[in-house]
């Protein structure tokens, strides 16, 4: 039985050009986690595997790195960056657990403004 | 240098057994998850049974499950297929190919071939 | 168990030509989704990985693409050498599956 849950960083905002840490968490569960997948809507971004570490996709090399933790760094964000980012967590013996992530990047003046205006 | 090297191939009538073996070296071999592909004589690839690295969880194609057993000795960097009640449509070159991040088969080899025939 | 369709069966081309094989999975395989070159009596090469990655000392001739169910190995320049069978593979979930094979002969 999968008694696991994953808790995400959830809906986060970003500057254009700037960097953010996607992070996941795996708890309840005293499963043994074997490999995480990062992807983006339906592109493999990375993997971090217990036994062969981590293996950046070639194609996001330059703006993606590893860590921190089981988490991913995601720099020179652009516009495009926008979207749905999923960790998804293999273990032993309970399967698959997957986490949900919505980046929205902002353009620098919108995402200043914004911060001006959030409620702590 | 990555090396896999099948052997344990022949033939044998149906309804008999084989022993697969392929050696790897040339990389940490309990780091990886690791495959058996088959291909009939002038037919595609089939994938038939494949081994994960950490857990050795095992999994298994629907045309050999219950038939044939995966398994892997890592202090021999070895792989195994144990074949049971072989019937003449398992005749084919037998594969084994390393699964990094069980994501892709990067190397192969040789293959060795089985052949179940009366 | 997903299905890997692979068009066309077979194709010819000439030395120099740009080739461009189909592989459509029966549902969404997001990225998981790996091309190999087989030749007669060789064991299958991996070229492409993950969709769109080249494999460590594959010619930059060939390419990948797509996500979801529709992806495309290209081979920009036809080579002498690059005559063989090609298979998509998806990596998505067990069973893993391969497509039916291209097989590229010469004109």
């Known amino acids: 039985m999968m008694t696991g849950t994953i808790e995400t960083t959830g809906n986060i905002s970003a500057e254009k050009g700037g960097s953010i840490i996607l992070q996941c968490h795996l708890s309840s569960t005293t499963a043994q986690v074997t490999q995480v997948n990062w992807e983006q809507q339906d592109q493999l971004l990375a993997i971090c595997n217990a036994d062969l570490g981590w293996h950046i996709s070639p194609s996001f090399k330059d703006r993606v790195a590893p860590g921190p933790g089981l988490g991913l760094t995601l720099q020179s964000l652009t516009v495009n960056d926008t979207g749905e980012y999923f960790c998804i967590y293999h273990t032993y013996p309970d399967g698959t657990y997957t986490g949900r992530i919505f980046l929205e990047v902002l353009e620098s003046s919108v995402a200043e403004h914004g911060a001006r205006f959030q409620i702590p | 240098e990555v090396q896999l090297l099948e052997s344990g191939g022949g033939l044998v009538q149906p309804g008999g057994s084989l022993r697969l073996s392929c050696a790897a070296s040339?990389?940490?071999?309990?780091?990886?998850?690791m495959n058996w592909v088959r291909q009939a004589p002038g037919k595609g690839l089939e994938w038939v049974a494949g081994i994960k690295s950490s857990s050795g969880n095992k999994y298994y194609a629907d045309s050999v499950k219950g038939r044939f057993t995966i398994s892997r000795d890592n202090s021999k960097n070895t792989l195994y297929l144990q074949m049971n009640s072989l019937r003449a449509e398992d005749t084919a070159v037998y594969y084994c190919?390393?699964?990094?991040?069980?994501?892709?088969?990067?190397?192969w080899g040789q293959g060795t071939l089985v052949t179940v025939s009366s | 168990d997903i299905q890997m369709t692979q068009s066309p069966s077979s194709l010819s081309a000439s030395v120099g030509d740009r080739v461009t094989i189909t592989c459509r999975a029966s549902?969404?395989?997001?990225?998981?989704l790996n091309w190999y070159q087989q030749k007669p009596g060789k064991a299958p090469k991996l070229l492409i990985y993950a969709a769109s990655s080249l494999q460590s000392g594959v010619p930059s001739r060939f390419s990948g693409s797509g996500s979801g169910t529709d992806f495309t190995l290209t081979i920009s320049s036809l080579q002498p050498e690059d005559f063989a069978t090609y298979y998509c593979?998806?990596?998505?979930?067990?069973?893993?599956?391969f497509g039916g094979g291209t097989k590229v002969e010469i004109k």
């Open positions: 040339g990389f940490t071999f309990s780091s990886y998850s």
């Open positions: 549902q969404s395989i997001s990225s998981y």
């Open positions: 190919a390393r699964g990094p991040y069980d994501v892709w088969m990067d190397y």
């Open positions: 593979q998806q990596s998505y979930s067990t069973p893993l599956t």
